[in-house]
Amino acid sequence: DSSKWVFEHPETLYAWEGACVWIPCTYRALDGDLESFILFHNPEYNKNTSKFDGTRLYESTKDGKVPSEQKRVQFLGDKNKNCTLSIHPVHLNDSGQLGLRMESKTEKWMERIHLNVSERPFPPHIQLPPEIQESQEVTLTCLLNFSCYGYPIQLQWLLEGVPMRQAAVTSTSLTIKSVFTRSELKFSPQWSHHGKIVTCQLQDADGKFLSNDTVQLNVKHTPKLEIKVTPSDAIVREGDSVTMTCEVSSSNPEYTTVSWLKDGTSLKKQNTFTLNLREVTKDQSGKYCCQVSNDVGPGRSEEVFLQVQYAPEPSTVQILHSPAVEGSQVEFLCMSLANPLPTNYTWYHNGKEMQGRTEEKVHIPKILPWHAGTYSCVAENILGTGQRGPGAELDVQYPPKKVTTVIQNPMPIREGDTVTLSCNYNSSNPSVTRYEWKPHGAWEEPSLGVLKIQNVGWDNTTIACAACNSWCSWASPVALNVQYAPRDVRVRKIKPLSEIHSGNSVSLQCDFSSSHPKEVQFFWEKNGRLLGKESQLNFDSISPEDAGSYSCWVNNSIGQTASKAWTLEVLYAPRRLRVSMSPGDQVMEGKSATLTCESDANPPVSHYTWFDWNNQSLPYHSQKLRLEPVKVQHSGAYWCQGTNSVGKGRSPLSTLTVYYSPETIGRR
């Protein structure tokens, strides 16, 4: 209706004596601004005066004057939009209708708001979800239709009178739509919360109790069960009777079915709260529980472990681990189903009782081959002694033992022989599957564990073999002791250290690198002639005639070896010089005469000097002195001198006769 003023505010506000009321309010006047505002308590329209009668709680006029007694009531609005009011404190007799008389320049309006003030703080209201189920989070809400800025309050949650640990979230609303304070508590109820009293307590700012609301929680839960057993320790002997009783301590809603489970499997035809087991057997040992269901689901009791006692059953032996490696540790475990557990054990190795072994486990820290064999045991408990089971086999594995390398040949072995060796061992587990030899060579293995060395070398000193299964065991190396003729025979000059000069003392040594056998003989030879039988050949004063090709021989019982020919070179000054003449010592003048200085020298003559009969050196320095044409006056005695690095030598005089030619004689 366009002729109406438009107001928005809560329809009714609630408070209690001594608290306050905050009234959120908005309006829209028909025209212009608000000029006058009067707050009536229970206004009534007077037709005679055409005005409203009633208690005036607040009045504001054009001049803005407010009577001092109106301080309790405050108009917090404005001239065009806001009409919010506050009454602080609020009294019981403020209950009723508040009338907001609004006047603008041309229009008037009366807006009514209900106020409900109680004598004491009214209780909040707890709101619960329609159903609460154990372990499912729910939100409990506590709602109070009150909120006022001037009067702070708090809502606290209590469970069975004790503040709840869970944190609550409090919110307030002071709007034109609603005024309230709300506390929300999230929690996951357990079955034990069923029937428990939850309180939402309204307190003032100081924590003083004002009012509360209470609910008793209805928590839906699976049946909660207790299992009782006779005998109470659930330990019986075969043939005894056992009774188990299932008690429902709580179920919401009521339970519908009952069943019994053994080791998690349902027992057929057992649907009562009592389980009777008559003349039990050991197979009935196990974990028993009862299961009771309701609409929420099944509930299970704790498990009762029923132990049916019996004497040990035939035992078996478990070996950790077989096969076992020699030197490792091995544990034997005697396994025998028995209740109570066996208290004593007897152990057997290959049928013979093992002394001092009475435990369930036997531990051998270092296994040896003799530990191999069959192990069995007997278990004993208070009800009797079991039987010895079939036992378990311990296989002790070890590398091949006492491995030796054996030479099959007759001794001694000579270089070039074919040698056969075998690899022998004493025992092995598992069996030997291969052999190894060292050093490695391009050798034949004609059969497993046999090595054939064709054309054995002089330097094949030792051979070792290994016999291998999962591991390799090496034999000590065996010496082949190959015999051979002396090797690397050579001539070595011992003295002099420098080149040999004629007249020097000279020693030559016959060297060799090795010989087997060691006993040797030496032979020196020059040009096929035996010179000596010592390792050294000595010259007290060497002469050029001693120069030549020398060899030495070394021999042992296997054979002899010659050195390479060694050339002995003797250095000497020129000697045996003579002058030879060509064509002869008598030459006709005008012809050619050649004089040659012949000598024996080492190193060869490097420089010649020619002399005449007057011992005058001639200006010629080559080995040959050529006179061409020869003259009569050339006649006379000539000699030459040869020089090398060692020294000089001179020839005797040789006479050249130059005779006149027939022409010269004819002229005379």
């Epitope: 004790v162 034990s192 029937g195 428990k196 009293i197 209470t214 008793q216 209805n218 207790e226 301590s249």
Partner: antibody, heavy 116, light 112 residues
């Protein structure tokens, strides 16, 4: 103060039914469960069951499941227990009771006599 | 349901005597949320409704004489009258209220 006022004594013939009332006052009726307890002559106390007046939810002792029916009327803050197919062994004093956090409130009891 | 076993079923004592009775529950009645035992003791005189004496196993209801006391936790509880008075002649019941309600069979106290 909290009060639970029960209806007067009843004499019934075997096979009949009886409805016992328990009027609550002095507290918010819907806040607490209302329990019923039976005491046969010279015997001990035996819990029958409860009703939650807030939502009319009931829970019974298995022994009374087919004997008692619990109801509540929020408008009058009154709880009722109806016993059906009465037999002589149902002769007893029937109490309504409720728990608060630290106390218990009991009605004065209603004697139900079943006699032919 | 939780079973309550009360003993003895009856006892006779002289005025001024210390009287004790026992109550055992088939399961614990201790509530973990507040660590309280949900066990009460009542006195009932012939023709009267039960009167609460003790709640939470050991807390005396206001107005109850100090000669009445309760103790115990979990499943084993004891009720004691330190000095028996003539007006104490009655039947006493234990009551668990942790889960549903169950009552003990009662102990009848008489004066010699």
């Amino acid at each position: 103060q909290v009060q639970l006022v029960q209806s007067g004594a009843e004499v019934k013939k075997p096979g009949a039914s009886v409805k016992v009332s328990c009027k609550a006052s002095g507290y918010t009726f819907t806040s607490y469960w209302l329990h019923w307890v039976r005491q046969a002559p010279g015997q001990g106390l035996e819990w029958i069951g409860y009703i939650n007046p807030r939502n009319d939810y009931t829970e019974y002792n298995q022994n009374f499941k087919d004997k008692a029916t619990l109801t509540a009327d929020k408008s009058t803050s009154t709880a009722y227990m109806e016993l059906s197919s009465l037999r002589s062994e149902d002769t007893a004093v029937y109490y309504c009771a409720r728990r608060d956090i630290t106390t218990f409130y009991w009605g004065q009891g209603t004697t139900v006599t079943v006699s032919s | 349901d939780i079973q309550m076993t009360q003993s003895p079923s009856s006892l006779s004592a002289s005025v001024g005597d210390r009287v004790t009775m026992s109550c055992k529950s088939s399961q614990s009645v201790l509530y973990s949320a507040n660590h309280k035992n949900y066990l009460a003791w009542y006195q009932q005189k012939p023709g009267k409704a039960p009167k609460l004496l003790i709640y939470w196993a050991s807390t005396r209801e206001s107005g109850v004489p100090s000669r009445f006391s309760g103790s115990g936790s979990g499943t084993d509880f004891t009720f004691t009258i330190s000095s028996l008075q003539p007006e104490d002649i009655a039947t006493y019941y234990c009551h668990q209220y942790l889960s549903s309600w169950t009552f003990g069979g009662g102990t009848k106290v008489e004066i010699k």
